[in-house]
């Protein structure tokens, strides 16, 4: 993902795939877009860690 590896925070488990425009956005480290509560942009994003 654009933002990369793991971040130590929890998110809601009920996620759905987000549209490609959101996937291609700025990374969180550059002040990028926050995750939509029901959107999962794929494994590996720093703002979307896997299960703890």
């Amino acid at each position: 993902g654009l933002a990369g590896g793991s971040a130590q925070s929890q998110r809601a488990p009920d996620r759905v795939l987000c549209h490609s425009g959101q996937q291609q956005g700025l990374p969180r480290a550059a002040g990028g877009s926050v995750p939509h509560p029901r959107c999962h942009c794929g494994a590996g994003r720093a703002d979307w860690p896997g299960p703890p």
């Epitope: 654009l2 933002a3 990369g4 590896g5 793991s6 971040a7 130590q8 925070s9 700025l26 990374p27 969180r28 480290a29 550059a30 002040g31 990028g32 877009s33 926050v34 509560p37 590996g44 720093a46 703002d47």
Partner: antibody, heavy 112, light 107 residues
Framework: EVQLQQSGPELVKPGASVKMSCKAS????????MMWVKQSHGKSLEWIGD????????SYNQKFKGKATLTVDKSSSTAYIQLNSLTSEDSAVYYC?????WGQGTLVTVSA | DIQMTQTTSSLSASLGDRVTITCRSS??????LNWYQQKPDGPVKLLIY???RLHSGVPSRFSGSGSGTDYSLTISNLEQEDLATYFC?????????FGGGTKVEIK
Amino acid sequence: EVQLQQSGPELVKPGASVKMSCKASGYTFTDYYMMWVKQSHGKSLEWIGDINPNNYDTSYNQKFKGKATLTVDKSSSTAYIQLNSLTSEDSAVYYCASKAYWGQGTLVTVSA
Amino acid sequence: DIQMTQTTSSLSASLGDRVTITCRSSQDISNSLNWYQQKPDGPVKLLIYSTSRLHSGVPSRFSGSGSGTDYSLTISNLEQEDLATYFCQQGHTLPWTFGGGTKVEIK
């Protein structure tokens, strides 16, 4: 046009606290992380932490836990950083940044 | 924390030169690398994110490349307005960390 307008310079005494603001305009404030960065003496940059303005979720650099507190006011599209128990090591320029754009910085000088 | 190293703290080049600035991370950051420009007494601006993606409004003479732990920013045709300090930043693992900066001066 994205703009991040930061509050003016602060001269504070050791041991005191300071609260700085960053007013955002030109984009949907709640859609983007707001991060804060410290720059000491015109040198390198240190990420303090960030906040999700939509749900107030914060992440901090361990180095700044207990030193910095990040908050937002959604109604005014304004982010805040409070620094407490100030020492000379906290003298620096503090930047807010969101949606890839940075504020102009707030100079904090800690001096007796 | 991931350490970001910019071994060249300053460099001097002539107008029109091709300038390359390098940045190394202490571990693989999987292309999660951003570049910023800070002009003297000026604002900080994002130039490139995710190794090679040009931020909106940034001149095409700026480009980025790299992988793993080694990354670079290239200015293909140096202009006077490029006088600035350039910082790399990793966005792979919290806390995000920055390199020490490379100051580009004009000969």
